[in-house]
C-alpha cells in the first residue's frame, strides 16, 4: 500500500467550538438551498477502495478542490459564515501542503475526479451542494487526519 507522509493535523484544529459551529452553520445554510438531495459528494463512493492510512491524503485533495473551485468563487454568498470558515479551511489546507503519498495514488485521484465531475456537471447547484457538505468535509478531515 502507498505510504503517506506528513498527513496529520493537530487535534487543536478541531477543538475550537466557535469555528466548528460556524462551519456547521454554513453547511446548514447552503443545504437549505440544495434541491438535489439524492446526490452525495462525500460518502461511500468517495471512500471506496481507499484505506484509512490514505484517507487524509484523499481529503486533502477534496479540501483543495473545494477551496479553489467552490468556496473562493462563491465567497460573497452565505455571509457572515463564509468569511470566517474559508480562512479556517485554507489554514487546514496549508498545514496539509506537505501531505503526500509515496507510490500509486491513481485509485484516489479517480475517486476525487468523480467528485469534481459531479460538481462541474451540476454547475452552480453542484457548488452549493459542496458548501452544504462542508460539515461532512470537516468531519472526514477530523476522522482521517488526527
Amino acid at each position: 500500500a502507498p505510504i503517506s507522509s506528513h498527513c496529520r493535523l493537530d487535534k487543536s484544529n478541531f477543538q475550537q467550538p466557535y469555528i466548528t459551529n460556524r462551519t456547521f452553520m454554513l453547511a446548514k445554510e447552503a443545504s437549505l438551498a440544495d434541491n438535489n438531495t439524492d446526490v452525495r459528494l462525500i460518502g461511500e463512493k468517495l471512500f471506496h477502495g481507499v484505506s484509512m492510512s490514505e484517507r487524509c491524503y484523499l481529503m486533502k485533495q477534496v479540501l483543495n478542490f473545494t477551496l479553489e473551485e467552490v468556496l473562493f468563487p462563491q465567497s460573497d454568498r452565505f455571509q457572515p459564515y463564509m468569511q470566517e470558515v474559508v480562512p479556517f479551511l485554507a489554514r487546514l489546507s496549508n498545514r496539509l501542503s506537505t501531505c503526500h503519498i509515496e507510490g500509486d495514488d491513481l485509485h484516489i485521484q479517480r475517486n476525487v475526479q468523480k467528485l469534481k465531475d459531479t460538481v462541474k456537471k451540476l454547475g452552480e447547484s453542484g457548488e452549493i451542494k459542496a458548501i452544504g457538505e462542508l460539515d461532512l468535509l470537516f468531519m472526514s478531515l477530523r476522522n482521517a487526519c488526527i
Epitope: K11, T20, F24, K28, M139
Partner: antibody, heavy 121, light 110 residues
Framework: EVQLVESGGGVVRPGGSLRLSCAAS????????MNWVRQAPGKGLEWVSG????????DYAASVKGRFTISRDNAKNSLYLQMNSLRAEDTALYHC??????????????WGRGTLVTVSS | QAALTQPASVSGSPGQSITISCTGA?????????VSWYQQHPGKAPKLIIY???KRPSGVSNRFSGSKSGNTASLTISGLQAEDEADYYC??????????FGGGTKLTVL
Amino acid sequence: EVQLVESGGGVVRPGGSLRLSCAASGFTFDDYGMNWVRQAPGKGLEWVSGVNWNGGTRDYAASVKGRFTISRDNAKNSLYLQMNSLRAEDTALYHCARGWYSGAAWNMGYWGRGTLVTVSS
Amino acid sequence: QAALTQPASVSGSPGQSITISCTGASGDVGAYNFVSWYQQHPGKAPKLIIYDVNKRPSGVSNRFSGSKSGNTASLTISGLQAEDEADYYCASLVSDFSVVFGGGTKLTVL
C-alpha cells in the same frame, strides 16, 4: 459476516468501576470508527462514546465525560469502555456499534447484542 | 432530555403510509447531513434503516425513505406492513462531535 460481541457487564456498586470489551470480526477493524451506545431498561437509545479508526479522536456524551474512557486495540480487533465512578443512572444494556461505511462512524450500521451493566447498592 | 424531538407514538393501517418527524431543539446546530434512522423490535438490537438523511443501506426495503426540511428530518414508511411495528429512533451527529438520539417513536400497525 460482521460480528460484534460485547462482554464485561455485571452488577457493581455505585462509585465502582467496570471495563467493557467488544470483540470485532468479519471486517478490517482499523478501517472503521466505533461507538458505544446504551439503553436503560424500557428507555430509549443513548450514545455514550465514539472513537475514530486510530484512537486519535475520542468523543463522549456529556453525561459520562470525565468518568468513562473509550479505547481500542487494533492488533486485537477490540474496542473497550472503561467506566469509573458508576452511578445508578448508568444502568443499561451497552451496545458496541460500527459505522455503516468506513469514515462515518455516526451511521451505526452494525450492532452487538449488548452487555448488561447494573449499578446498585 | 432528548436533543431531537420525535412523537411518542404513531399508528397506521396495513398498506397506508406514515411519517415520523424528528426536530432539532431550539438553538441546536442542525447538522442534518448526518441524520440516521433506526428500527428496533422488542428485545433486539437496533437496525440502521436510513443514513445521511436519505440513503438506504443495502437490504433495507425501499418502502423506507428519509428527507429533511429546515430543522426537521422525516422518516416515511409506505405500504405499511405488520412487521414494521417497532420503535423508531432518529439520530444526528452535532457540532460538539457527539451523537444525539431522538426519544423514539412507537409505531403501531392497526
